[in-house]
């Protein structure tokens, strides 16, 4: 739970954040997990700790391993683990899957590609961007802050994009590269006022106390890629995240494209261990886009367990 994978290339800078947060945090100590040896904080070392961050300047293949961070405060100490893998640089242009960050999707209206992990580094603009190892040139490509903007996106723009920047530490410069895939969504389509397919307006959903319950909010917004479309749940008019009940969480479902080609979204509301007080809440399925917002309200009712007589 408190472990995080991090990876980098040899001879590049790699900065890793402790996956455990203090509440509050006074100091963070880092150790090599295998030897329990403390990692120094002096910046003259190639590998050193700096608060929540562990810095490899530059990284070496031999640095691979598990690192322990302990977030200390007067009350409680919290332990996290960073699983670090440093790879040799590939001689060819191919970027292997294990070096790829999460894929992002874009469309004609929205084509930002963020440079992964860049927030951890002390870098200055501009970023260099490459697609399939070729430096990006031409007025369609604009490096802006920590992301790349592509104008008039076409399907041919799909591919692997690498950002390259320089991390500066006490006057010394270190190179960093990070790669992620970019996919292009079809933009042919139109947008409608949201249509909520489920739940029905003022639906009563039967649930069993003590059991888990799922409510699905499903809505369609038009055809093709939608510039702004969202489905979400509210409890008594409050966002789930603000309601502060950990038993009730929302989870994004799959983007759906029905046979008629409509672009639809699902949001599942999961209620763990249904309690009596959950029956008193108003559950609103909200669907919104540029045309407006539609709301369907659901209430829960107790399902009476059926008596089975022999």
């Amino acid at each position: 739970k408190f472990s995080k994978q991090s990876w980098g290339l040899e001879n590049e800078a790699l900065i890793v954040r402790c996956p455990r947060q203090g509440k509050p945090s006074y100091t963070v100590d880092w150790y090599y997990s295998q030897t329990n040896k403390s990692i120094p904080t002096q910046e003259r070392n190639r590998v050193f700790a700096s608060g929540q961050l562990l810095k490899f300047l530059p990284a070496a293949v031999a640095d691979s391993g598990i690192y322990t961070c302990i977030v200390r405060s007067p009350t409680f100490n919290r332990t996290g683990y960073a699983n670090v893998t440093i790879y040799k640089k590939q001689s060819d242009c191919n970027v292997p899957d294990y070096l790829m960050y999460s894929t992002v999707s874009g469309s004609e209206k929205n084509s930002k590609i963020y440079c992964p992990t860049i927030d951890l580094y002390n870098w200055t603009a501009p970023l260099e961007w490459f697609k399939n190892c070729q430096a990006l040139q031409g007025s369609r490509y604009r490096a802006h802050k920590s992301f790349l903007v592509i104008d008039n996106v076409m399907t041919e723009d799909a591919g692997d994009y690498t950002c390259k920047f320089i991390h500066n530490e006490n006057g010394a410069n270190y190179s960093v590269t990070a790669t992620r895939s970019f996919t292009v969504k079809d933009e042919q389509g139109f947008s409608l006022f949201p249509v909520i397919g489920a739940p029905a307006q003022n639906e009563i959903k039967e649930v069993e106390i003590g059991k888990n319950a799922n409510l699905t909010c499903s809505a369609c917004f038009g055809k093709g890629t939608q510039f702004l479309a969202a489905v979400l749940w509210q409890l008594n008019g409050t966002k789930i995240t603000d309601f502060g009940e950990p038993r009730i969480q929302q989870e994004e479902g799959q983007n759906q494209s029905f046979s008629n080609g409509l672009a639809c979204l699902d949001m599942v509301l999961r209620i763990a261990d249904v309690k009596e007080e959950d029956l008193l809440l108003q559950y609103d399925c909200l669907a919104l886009n540029l045309h407006g917002l539609r709301r369907h309200t659901v209430r829960l009712s107790r399902k009476n367990p059926i008596d089975h007589h022999s």
Partner: antibody
Framework: QVQLVQSGAKVKKPGATVKISCKAS????????MHWVQQAPGKGLEWMGA????????VYAKKFKGRVTITADKSSSTAYMELSSLRSEDTAVYYC???????????WGQGTLVTVSS | DIQMTQSPSSLSASVGDRVTITCRSS???????????LYWYQQKPGKAPKLLIY???NLASGVPSRFSSSGSGTDFTLTISSLQPEDFATYYC?????????FGQGTKVEIK
């Protein structure tokens, strides 16, 4: 917005046990330590102890150790403070208070008055 | 335990006055991380304390800029540059350097 709502005032006899609840909302309960602070009538503030709701780990002030038990129920985002072997000097307002990433005692409950009287 | 001593225990002032409250700790509140773990709270009758200042000199969210705090490792000062009607309350200093966390005995600011 963040809210800590405590249970109502209680009157107890010497030797009895009192249990106060503190229901949190507006933030992720397990992401904040919960502390308890005592304030006797006309007196100052005294730290009693704390819990990390994520792990259930607790820490107590020496003065209250052995008499105080702090617990947390993640499912209802509620923290509890139980004080046993009550005596008249335990008559006080008890506050629950939550921490943030930057500091302790960021949010406070409205307080619960406990009166110990025979 | 770290002792926190405030002075004065009470003071009378008028709206617009500059008010200074001092707090002394029995041990330096300077942590090895360079932060001084000194806090100030305001409490009004029948209400819960409210955080004013954290880590010596940082204003908590929503606190007016007329409140300020300064000090070294053991001697601290809370200043209200121009006292407002809503500032009449009791003020507590506290340390969060080490357990047990301790508070000063409070300074009551009353209307003259």
């Amino acid at each position: 917005q963040v809210q800590l709502v405590q249970s109502g005032a209680k009157v107890k006899k010497p030797g009895a046990t009192v249990k106060i609840s503190c229901k949190a909302s507006g933030y992720i309960f397990i992401d904040s330590e919960m502390h308890w602070v005592q304030q006797a009538p006309g007196k100052g503030l005294e730290w009693m102890g704390a819990i990390d709701p994520e792990t259930g780990d607790t820490v107590y002030a020496k003065k209250f150790k052995g008499r105080v038990t702090i617990t947390a129920d993640k499912s209802s985002s509620t923290a509890y403070m139980e004080l046993s072997s009550l005596r008249s000097e335990d008559t006080a307002v008890y506050y629950c208070t939550g921490s943030t990433t930057d500091y302790y005692f960021a949010y406070w409950g409205q307080g619960t008055l406990v009166t110990v009287s025979s | 335990d770290i002792q926190m001593t405030q002075s004065p225990s009470s003071l009378s002032a008028s709206v617009g006055d500059r008010v200074t409250i001092t707090c002394r700790s029995s041990k330096s509140l300077l942590h090895s991380n360079g932060i001084i773990y000194l806090y100030w709270y305001q409490q009004k009758p029948g209400k819960a304390p409210k955080l004013l200042i954290y880590q010596l000199s940082n204003l908590a969210s929503g606190v007016p800029s007329r409140f300020s705090s300064s000090g070294s490792g053991t001697d601290f000062t809370l200043t209200i540059s121009s006292l407002q009607p809503e500032d009449f309350a009791t003020y507590y200093c506290a340390q969060n350097l080490e357990l047990p966390f301790t508070f000063g005995q409070g300074t009551k600011v009353e209307i003259k």
